[in-house]
């Protein structure tokens, strides 16, 4: 028998620096987690201790801090290189700035291969990125060889800007012919390592006959056995097992995001390739692993232009930006539709000739609206300043919900209105009219929408059985806010760019900005 | 497949300043970063510096700022390796190579180069 | 900059016979190490990078090892086309630097 321990990361989303337990801005360094000097520490240990170890990451590294907004992904491509990571699937975010945006910071970069099966470049692209990521790579390991295959969430179109020359094709029709092309070189160890998240990471499993083990991405999900350390509640065992059409035993993992965990995975192989056995957790990156000093004083000579960055001008404004409780709570406020606007703009994707666009609907808590910005200070507007307004380090997301729920949504909006709690909607691409004489859980008395299929946009009232895409902060599409309804009925959810890039890439674009309130959110017989 | 073509051999005289070049094939030019190394008569190898052909961006062995010039010529595929103020010490073999995975995969045939009056 | 160290500078070996050659960094290089070889008036050939790693068309009596700061390569059974010298090149750190090679000669 032959043992391979497999160390994985996924989604770590430009969490380079230590964070809290919830993986935004560290505030108490004893109680902090996670971090590529400590997750150096943590791999070197276990490189040290065994003798057959692979490093390897199932994607999004890109987007997420500040760390991805002023180095575009040179970042990751340096302390990936750093930590020696032996192979990376491409995930969706990795087209956030473009296929140029991932071929120069990281493809030319790596020391390491980038790799996705399913993702066909046609066109002049063809030959421009020929070579720079593969469907496979064959790894020595020990006295064996490993081949990894990779794949990319088919869905990264609609998610990300990866142009129009790469075509995402169906990832188990992709992923069979490269496994089989491996048994023909005579490799029998075959890990898919993707990016597609857990549902298809189990349908790999299930499917592509002649894949090992299945290390993947894009969900967040978090497996564990026994007792879980932090907060994370799991999804199912670690590793999850999944009986394949041709009757083995296929090991499937996760490991959450943000760099919190290490995925650690012990495989045993017979002579003939097959999976004896397989056991593992993922081991929580706390504060009792010590941050390795020589990357550490690496990633604070890399801080060093993110601080210089935060208090340069992004654009301006000429009107006074109201985020305060006592408006955003309440009505609708200009700050409010400010973030609305930047949300669609960043979800611009002409995918389709019948659609103006994939999606036209916002919303947004008002309780996640922080600060206000002051015009009065010659209309400067910094990444500090969007930084008080949006503190929590979270992403802006898309999924997919019927009418029904979101009626159910705006609904709980105003169920307790007046007590200034953060609920209370924020929109865009969205007229709601509310009668707070009536009932809560009935003061919705209005609820039109904005057409994406069609040429000229227009508001339509709200179908109940209709399904609609919308974005919303990972907050609300957790349920947080009591908005349970999102988080028990949605359909789909793919986590999006972080929250203050989102709005800083949209004023640098506008340069100057104007938001009005405009009657997106009205109240009706004289209520209010 | 690919290859990167280099003129045999340059004979300059000391002082003047000389231009080598590679031209690659059998992949897309501006993709891969171009090293250049440098090999002394019956030596060792030295690096020289990298061109990133895409944007012109360099990195360069501090011993040969002041006598390498790395340039790129995208209309032509053509990198370039400009060395100035000429001695016998320059007299070498030039190599250019395409990096991959940041060490060098594929190399040039290399240009002798003669530092003579 | 970061030394590297090869030894032996020369030896002689006979065909079939098993060949390693060293190579030390002068400091922890991360695995990023290529071996070459080259042969009288011609380029350099790349045989191995990330250490152990083979490139594509590398016979596979070629392997290497090692990680720190210590690398080796081997040649499993000698053949009389592998004589030629053999250097090593640490590309962890800007300026990328080669050690002073191995000459390989056939008894």
């Known amino acids: 028998a032959w043992e391979l321990t497999i160390l994985h990361t996924n989604d770590v989303h430009s969490r380079l620096e230590q964070t809290s337990e919830d993986s935004s801005k560290c505030v108490n360094a004893s109680r902090c987690m996670g971090g590529v000097a400590r997750l150096f520490t943590k791999v070197q240990q276990i490189r040290r201790a065994e003798p057959n170890v692979l490093l390897l990451d199932a994607g999004d590294q890109y987007q997420g801090t500040i760390w991805f907004t002023v180095y575009k992904g040179a970042e990751v491509a340096h302390f990936m290189n750093a930590l020696r990571y032996d192979a990376m699937a491409l995930g969706n975010h990795e087209f956030d700035n473009g296929v140029e945006g991932l071929i120069e910071p990281l493809l030319k970069e790596a020391k390491f291969p980038i790799l996705s099966a399913n993702i066909k470049a046609k066109g002049p692209l063809a030959s421009q990125i020929s070579g720079l990521y593969l469907p496979y790579k064959v790894l020595p390991v020990g006295d064996e060889v490993v081949g990894i295959v990779g794949y990319t969430s088919k869905e990264t179109p609609f998610l990300s800007n990866p142009g129009t020359n790469l075509v995402f094709e169906d990832e188990i029709t992709a992923l069979q012919p490269e496994v089989d092309k491996l048994k023909t070189l005579n490799v029998n160890k075959i890990i898919a390592l993707g990016h597609s998240g857990f549902e298809m990471d189990k349908l790999i499993a299930q499917k592509v006959r002649g894949v090992d083990v299945v290390v993947g991405g894009h969900s967040n999900t978090f497996l564990y056995t026994g007792n879980p350390p932090s907060k994370e509640v799991p999804a199912g065992k670690y590793p999850f097992i999944v009986t394949s059409d041709d009757g083995r035993k296929v090991p499937v993992v996760q490991a959450y995001a943000f760099g919190k965990y290490l995925g650690y995975l012990k495989i045993e192989f017979d002579e003939r390739g097959n999976v004896i056995s397989s056991h593992g957790n993922p081991i929580l990156l706390n504060s009792s692993i010590p941050e390795d000093p020589s990357i550490k004083a690496d990633i604070n000579k890399w801080r060093i232009k993110l601080d210089n960055y935060s208090t340069q001008e992004l654009g301006k404004t000429i009107v006074y930006l109201d985020g305060s409780s006592q408006s955003c709570r309440f009505r609708e406020c200009n700050m409010g539709n400010l973030i609305c606007d930047a949300m669609i703009n960043n979800n611009l994707r002409h995918t389709d000739e019948m659609f103006w666009n994939h999606v036209s609907m916002c919303i947004l808590n008002g309780g996640g609206i922080r600060s206000p910005i002051d015009e009065r200070n010659n209309g400067t507007i910094t990444w500090e300043n969007l930084a008080a307004v949006l503190p929590f380090g979270g992403t802006f997301d898309l999924v997919q919900l019927k009418g029904s729920t979101l009626k159910k949504a705006f609904e709980h909006s105003v169920h307790r209105y007046g007590q200034s709690t953060g609920e209370f909607l924020q929109v865009g691409g969205i007229h709601v009219v509310y009668d707070l004489s009536r009932k809560p859980g009935d003061r919705v008395v209005k609820l039109d929408v904005l057409c994406t299929k069609c040429r000229v946009p227009s508001y339509d009232p709200l179908k109940m059985d209709e399904v609609y895409k919308v974005i919303l902060p990972n907050f609300l599409a957790n349920g947080g806010d009591g908005f349970q309804m999102i988080k028990d009925e949605l359909l789909r959810h793919d986590s999006g760019d972080q929250d203050i890039n989102v709005v800083s890439t949209y004023i640098s674009k506008m340069k100057v900005i104007y938001p009005a309130v405009e009657g997106r959110i009205k109240f009706s017989t004289g209520s209010h | 497949q690919v290859q990167l073509q280099q003129p045999g051999a340059e004979v300059v005289k000391p002082g003047a300043s000389v231009r080598l070049s590679c031209k690659p094939s059998g992949y897309f030019f501006t993709s891969y970063w171009m090293h250049w190394v440098k090999q002394r008569p019956g030596q060792g190898l030295e690096w020289i510096g990298e061109i990133n052909p895409s944007n012109g961006r360099t990195n360069y062995n501090e011993n040969f700022k002041s006598k390498a010039t790395l340039t790129v010529d995208t209309s032509s595929s053509t990198a370039y390796l400009q060395l100035s103020s000429l001695t016998s010490e320059d007299s070498a073999v030039y190599y250019c190579?395409?990096?991959?995975?940041?060490?060098?995969?594929?190399w040039g045939q290399g240009t002798t180069l003669t530092v003579s009056s | 900059d970061i030394k590297m160290t090869q030894s032996p500078s020369s030896m002689y070996a006979s065909l079939g016979e098993r060949v390693t050659f060293t190579c030390k960094a002068s400091q922890d290089i991360n695995t990023y190490l290529n071996w070459f070889q080259q042969k009288p008036g011609k380029s350099p050939k790349t045989l191995i990078y990330?250490?152990?790693r083979l490139l594509d068309g590398v016979p596979s009596r070629f392997s290497g090892s090692g990680s720190g700061q210590d690398y080796s390569l081997t040649i499993s059974s000698l053949e009389y086309e592998d004589m030629g010298i053999y250097y090593c090149?640490?590309?962890?750190?800007?300026?990328?630097?080669f050690g002073g090679g191995t000459k390989l000669e056939i008894k």
């Open positions: 990330r250490a152990n």
């Open positions: 090149l640490q590309y962890d750190e800007i300026p990328y630097t």
């Open positions: 190579a395409r990096r991959n995975y940041g060490y060098p995969d594929y």
